[in-house]
């Protein structure tokens, strides 16, 4: 069954957690649909972003971080592992020094923390996708 | 009650038609939520367009058409009619020479046509917004 | 190994301009991230500027904004300040520094350069 | 008026345990990073990303951070420790600030 779109979630996360991602492109291609993944500081959606991950499929990804309300550097890569009209599974891994992206069980993107992530207290994906599936695994202490 | 994103529609345009939609942005302006309309020479979504519509909320609107699987030269305005939050209705009037686009009321842009607009068989409206109303009169001949 | 040299520095009167430079080696220097800071005599650090891998995001700290302007050239491996309408206030040995990630901080610094401003 | 605060001065005995302390709001959400400097040297980072070591910085120094506050742990140390000692973080991810800076006095 599917999970509504904008789809919010409360999230602490930590080095060792991994957010876990299903769903598939509302449209084709060719008409450049997007999947938005935001990390934020607050249960707000007008907080900060700590981690911000947008596909414009079939095209590109761009990375970035929403500090005092303010979009900083961008990252962009044109590494396109999602294929038009199929599912994705992406998980969002907390590593210590970075956010390792995988796409369909393949590394496809790195974001350095600009951010600690312990900061992060809601996650919310948006955009042109269907969502089958959302999860935040936490690391055994 | 709400339709459903995207809404899909077949339609038939010639001067003198208007499209109406009413619904509103899923996202607050600082997140850039997208509304778009996009009108269809054919009933598949991958098909050409007469008349592309992009909102992105709080920034910029652009218009466009896609001839032979191609996107043609980009027609910007900054002009943001669109309040944050606030439920908007948009109207699209066939005009003998081009698109005139109200919202709330309001003539806010116009393109000129590119492909004649009888050449219109679907409109697909999308992207992050909840619609409410979505209605195409014809001119009474 | 890797080097940060910066040169540049001098006496100049208030309202004068010098231009520093850092020449960088022994990494990919369009790789990262650079910064001026600079510690005035006997005090503590201060952050000056900072500018991204291509140079089209810069910053600057409020003391020196709209004086001072960074820039690099990825093709010689340098980076550079402007200084200008100097004050007494920007008398200071200024160091170049290697940014790693937010994570990492500012892993290498240069030996620096003094620049006295005095009348 | 530094957005970082430090003590301007630590002691410690040799061969006991020396904990300089910094703090600020934005080390809640921002990592801490710290830097050594001997007279007449340029700074050198012994701790970055809050706890962690460089290659080469001896197993003595360490770093935690808990809410606001970053603190540089030197266990056991030595007389070439002596040094002044800065904490470092960000106003936001371009904006590098720094704290005071401590003076690290080995008896």
């Known amino acids: 069954s599917l999970l509504p779109v904008p789809y919010t979630e409360a999230a602490s996360l930590s080095t060792g957690s991994t957010v876990t991602i299903k769903g598939r492109p509302l449209a084709c291609f060719l008409n450049e649909p997007y999947l938005q993944v935001d990390f934020h500081t607050e249960m707000k959606e007008e907080s900060d972003i700590v981690f911000h991950f947008q596909v414009c499929f079939g095209r590109r990804v761009v990375m970035n971080s929403r500090e005092y309300g303010a979009w900083k550097q961008q990252v962009e890569s044109k590494n396109m592992p999602f294929q038009d009209g199929q599912e994705f599974e992406l998980s969002i891994s907390v590593l210590p020094d970075k956010y390792q992206v995988m796409v369909n069980g393949q590394s496809s993107y790195t974001f350095d923390h600009r951010i600690k992530p312990e900061a992060v207290k809601m996650v919310q994906v948006w955009r042109d996708i269907s969502l089958t599936k959302f999860n935040v695994s936490y690391l055994k202490r | 009650s709400l339709l459903p994103v995207p809404y899909t529609e077949a339609a038939s345009l010639s001067t003198g038609s208007t499209v109406t939609i009413k619904g509103r942005p899923l996202a607050c302006f600082l997140n850039e939520p997208y509304l778009q309309v996009d009108f269809h020479t054919e009933m598949k979504e991958e098909s050409d367009i007469v008349f592309h519509f992009q909102v992105c909320f709080g920034r910029r609107v652009v218009m466009n058409s896609r001839e032979y699987g191609a996107w043609k030269q980009q027609v910007e305005s900054k002009n943001m009619p669109f309040q944050d939050g606030q439920e908007f209705e948009l109207s699209i009037s066939v005009l003998p020479d081009k698109y005139q686009v109200m919202v709330n009321g309001q003539s806010s842009y116009t393109f000129d046509h590119r492909i004649k607009p009888e050449a219109v068989k679907m409109v697909q409206v999308w992207r992050d917004i909840s619609l409410t109303k979505f209605n195409v009169s014809y001119l009474k001949r | 190994q890797l080097q940060l040299v910066e040169s540049g520095g001098g006496l100049v009167q208030p309202g004068g301009s010098l231009r520093l430079s850092c020449a960088a080696s022994?990494?990919?220097?369009?790789?990262?991230?650079m910064y001026w800071v600079r510690q005035a005599p006997g005090k503590g650090l201060e952050w000056v500027s900072a500018?991204?891998?291509?140079?089209?995001?810069?910053d600057y700290a409020g003391s020196v904004k709209g004086r001072f302007t960074i820039s690099r050239d990825n093709t010689k491996s340098t980076v550079y300040l402007q200084m200008n309408t100097l004050k007494p206030e920007d008398t200071a040995l200024y160091y170049c520094?290697?940014?790693?990630?937010?994570?990492?901080?500012?892993?290498?610094w240069g030996k620096g350069t003094l620049v006295t401003v005095s009348s | 008026q530094s957005a970082l605060t430090q003590p301007s001065a630590v002691s410690v005995s040799l061969g006991q345990t020396a904990r300089i302390t910094c703090q600020g709001a934005k080390l809640g959400r921002y990592y801490g990073i710290w830097y050594q400097q001997k007279p007449g040297q340029a700074p050198v980072q012994v701790i970055y990303?809050?706890?962690n070591r460089p290659s080469g910085i001896p197993e003595r120094f360490s770093g935690s951070s808990s809410g606001g506050t970053a603190t540089l742990t030197i266990s056991g140390a030595q007389a070439e420790d002596e040094a002044d000692y800065y904490c470092?973080?960000?106003?936001?991810?371009?904006?590098?600030?720094f704290g005071g800076g401590t003076h690290l006095t080995v008896l």
């Open positions: 022994g990494f990919t220097f369009s790789n990262y991230w």
């Open positions: 520094l290697r940014g790693g990630s937010y994570y990492g901080g500012m892993d290498y």
């Open positions: 990303g809050d706890s």
């Open positions: 470092q973080s960000y106003e936001s991810s371009t904006s590098p600030v």
């Open positions: 500018i991204d891998v291509g140079g089209g995001t810069t």
